[in-house]
């Protein structure tokens, strides 16, 4: 499997909520001995590799925001810590995987990365990520609602070697 980012850019007004989305593509192993670790973090566009740097989202680390579940299960962050920061990550049965950020501020602008790790027999088997940019705008030029820009077919499949 690999990770697709349906949208590469989200442009939102201050105060709005946004849901950033990643999706698993291709055959996914859902065996009883397989679990998936999914998480989100902020990063910067490195010259060598995007998403190599892991920075917190609203002071929450990728460990705070992670989902850990079997291949056939849905999951979402229910802990108070994330919700107190206006964040919630979720995953469904169909490979869709998202983080919702509430009440956006200008400080939320930046590069966001989703990370999926397939774990079998308690060790990392396969690791992929996707990247997208969030721009929060204010003033008269800001849109009234979030505007999303589809990724090009090549950009939508961000692949990183394990």
């Amino acid at each position: 499997f690999k990770v697709a980012t349906p949208y590469s850019l989200y442009v939102c007004p201050e105060g709005q909520n946004v849901t950033l989305t990643c999706r698993l593509l291709g055959p996914v192993d859902k065996g009883h001995d397989v679990t998936f670790y999914k998480t989100w973090y902020r990063s910067s566009r490195g010259e060598v590799q995007t998403c190599s740097e892991r920075r917190p989202i609203r002071n929450l680390t990728f460990q705070d925001l992670h989902l850990h579940h079997g291949g056939h299960q849905a999951a979402n962050t229910s802990h108070d810590l994330a919700q107190r920061h206006g964040l919630e990550s979720a995953s469904d049965h169909h490979g869709n995987f998202s983080i919702t950020m509430r009440n956006l501020t200008l400080l939320d602008s930046g590069l966001y990365c989703c990370l999926v790790v397939e774990i079998r027999h308690h060790h990392s088997e396969h690791r992929v990520h996707g990247a997208m940019e969030l721009q929060v705008q204010t003033g008269k030029d800001a849109p009234s609602n979030c505007v999303v820009y589809p990724s090009s077919s090549q950009d939508s499949e961000n692949i990183t070697a394990a």
Epitope: P27, V28, D29, K30, G31, H32, G71, H94, E118, E157
Partner: antibody, heavy 113, light 111 residues
């Protein structure tokens, strides 16, 4: 855990044939399953797979001639317009992410006039 | 689709010796490491030895090892034993359609 193929037999060219793969010890709802064939004295040739969502993926040469489907307990390989070049042992395998870790013993399909 | 070339097609080794089999893909395998190795004996199905280029499958002897990345991979059998006589196949996994391609096989004869 085991995988076993059945349905292989001697057929004449042009005859359709469906092979069945029966699994035990694990659920098809959680496993990707593939078909691979091997002509007598030759190497392994990948045909295609069906994933846990029921989506199928085929080798380019196999598209249109082979159809993989599944029920809750079996995976089928439907073959149309068989020719003598399709004579082979057909293997069913459980596919993890990028490799086959559990294979059946194979079933022989012989196409001859 | 990718073409996978295995060399040599046949190799002879003495008991206790070392065998090296090469596998070259015409295009990079997915993630640069989605390459597996199988052992097949006459009348039997393939048996998984190595997955993701270098990971030893559970229950397989540590005399087998895999290495490589991208398009070039190697299977090494050290301390060859009589039971290692078989045909060995590599298989690349490719994300442009999610398909596998097998190499042509290498027959290992143990003297």
């Amino acid at each position: 855990q085991s995988v076993e193929e059945s349905g292989g037999r001697l057929v004449t060219p042009g005859t359709p044939l469906t092979l069945t793969c029966t699994v035990s010890g694990f659920s098809l709802s959680s496993a990707n399953m593939g078909w691979v064939r091997q002509a007598p004295g030759e190497g392994l040739e990948y045909i295609g797979l069906i994933d846990t969502d029921g989506t199928t993926y085929y080798a380019s040469w196999a598209k249109g001639r082979f159809t993989i489907s599944r029920t809750s307990t079996t995976v089928d390989l439907k073959m149309t317009s068989l020719t003598t070049e399709d004579t082979a042992t057909y293997f069913c395998a459980r596919l993890r992410t990028g490799y086959g870790d559990l294979w059946g013993p194979g079933t022989l399909v012989a196409v001859s006039s | 689709q990718a073409v996978v070339t295995q060399t040599p097609s046949s190799v002879s080794a003495a008991v206790g010796g070392t065998v090296t089999i090469s596998c070259q893909s015409s295009q990079s395998v997915y993630n640069n490491n989605f390459l597996s190795w199988y052992q097949q004996k006459p009348g039997q199905p393939p048996k998984l030895l190595i997955y993701r280029a270098s990971n030893l499958e559970t229950g397989v002897s540590s005399r087998f090892s895999g290495s490589g990345s991208g398009t070039q991979f190697t299977l090494t059998i050290s301390g060859v034993q009589c039971d290692d006589a078989a045909t060995y196949y590599c298989a690349g996994y490719y994300s442009s359609g999610w398909y596998y391609t097998f190499g042509g096989g290498t027959e290992v004869v143990v003297k």
